[in-house]
């Protein structure tokens, strides 16, 4: 069965300077491949976080993603700024062999509204 990526919140509002959690769960870890968060769509989309060991300032995972059966890929964004506003997508990839990883499923997106303090 095809993996499903669920982002339960269509939108979240957060005051500038505060933190917010963007929720994402998957129904399967197969086919093997990373999960990444992006802001925006298409050619201009921006990589926000990747669950592949790199460090991303202000962003961290919420659950224990080193669990071998972890299905929760939610993230916490700290010290939110107005520039963080936009729609965030949780995306499951299938690892490529000699080619880049292939996107196989995306969540429906969560729009982040940043409120002035």
């Amino acid at each position: 069965t095809e993996v499903k990526v669920t982002q339960p919140e269509k939108s979240v509002s957060v005051a500038a300077g505060d933190s917010t959690i963007l929720n994402c769960t998957v129904t399967s870890l197969l086919p093997v491949g990373p999960i990444r968060w992006y802001r925006g769509v298409g050619q201009s989309r921006l990589l926000i976080y990747s669950f592949t060991g790199e460090h991303f300032p202000r962003i961290r995972n919420v659950s224990d993603t080193t669990k071998r059966n972890n299905m929760d890929f939610s993230i916490r964004i700290s010290n939110v700024t107005p520039e963080d506003a936009g729609t965030y997508y949780c995306v499951k990839f299938q690892r490529g062999s000699s080619e880049p990883d292939t996107e196989i499923q995306s969540g429906g997106g969560t729009e982040v509204y940043v409120l002035a303090k």
């Epitope: 870890l29 197969l30 086919p31 093997v32 990373p34 669950f51 592949t52 060991g53 224990d64 993603t65 080193t66 669990k67 071998r68 059966n69 972890n70 690892r95 062999s97 000699s98």
Partner: antibody, heavy 117, light 108 residues
């Protein structure tokens, strides 16, 4: 520099127990899953057990119920309690740091466990 | 579970290219790595995540995959590359790590 230093090996009789330790430095231990891998004399590598950063545990079938992996994130130390030892458990036991997808990137030098009557 | 199969030995002359294969995993559910072990020493990771080389590993080491076979390629083999090489796999279906039997690389 990443360092993994095992200790606690020795010569024991069948049925006896040992506690192996792996002291780590050079990285944020609490963020990584860890594993124990063993190598019998003149043989290949065998994965024994793994533990997530939060303490979820995994074992190869042959050691389930006899071996217990644990960690103390405050002491930067990984443990393997080995009980009811048999001659087949004679091996060098290595601790290894896991990558995001549960392969291994850094290894300790190993500690030798010899089970002999 | 699954078994990873490697050739017991591979021989190559210095400066030539060595290829060590590993088969038996399920590409849908398995990630691969290659580990080098010299006599009396601990293993060293030369490739992980199919084709990722740690920063301290020479560029002559590379990994690739095709179907259910993964390959470690050592270009311009040097005498110091003589060692046992183990293919390792992590199966996301069973949550288990497996190793191949090892391949002894001899530099003639």
């Amino acid at each position: 520099d990443v360092q993994l230093v095992e200790s606690g090996g020795g010569v024991v009789r069948p049925g006896e127990s040992l506690r192996l330790s792996c002291a780590v430095s050079g990285f944020r231990f609490s963020s990584y899953a860890m594993s124990w891998v063993r190598q019998a004399p003149g043989k290949g590598l065998e994965w024994v057990s793994g533990i997530s950063s939060g303490g979820d545990t995994y074992y190869v079938d042959s050691v389930k119920g006899r071996f217990t992996i644990s960690r103390d994130n405050s002491k930067n130390t990984l443990y393997l309690q080995v009980n009811s030892l048999t001659a087949e458990d004679t091996a060098i036991y290595y601790c290894a740091r896991e990558t995001w997808n549960h392969l291994f990137d850094y290894w300790g030098l190993g500690t030798l466990v010899t089970v002999s009557s | 579970s699954y078994e990873l199969t490697q050739p017991p030995s591979v021989s190559v002359s210095p400066g030539q290219t060595a290829r060590i294969t590993c088969s038996g995993g399920d590409y849908y559910s398995t990630y691969y790595a290659w580990y080098q072990q010299k006599p009396g020493q601990a293993p060293v990771t030369v490739i992980h995540s199919d084709d990722k080389r740690p920063s301290d590993i020479p560029e002559r080491f590379s990994g690739s995959s095709s179907g259910t076979t993964v390959t470690l390629t050592i270009s311009g083999v040097q005498a110091e590359d003589e060692a046992d090489y183990y293919c390792g796999g992590y199966d996301g279906r069973t949550y288990i790590n497996t190793f191949g039997g090892g391949t002894k690389l001899t530099v003639l």
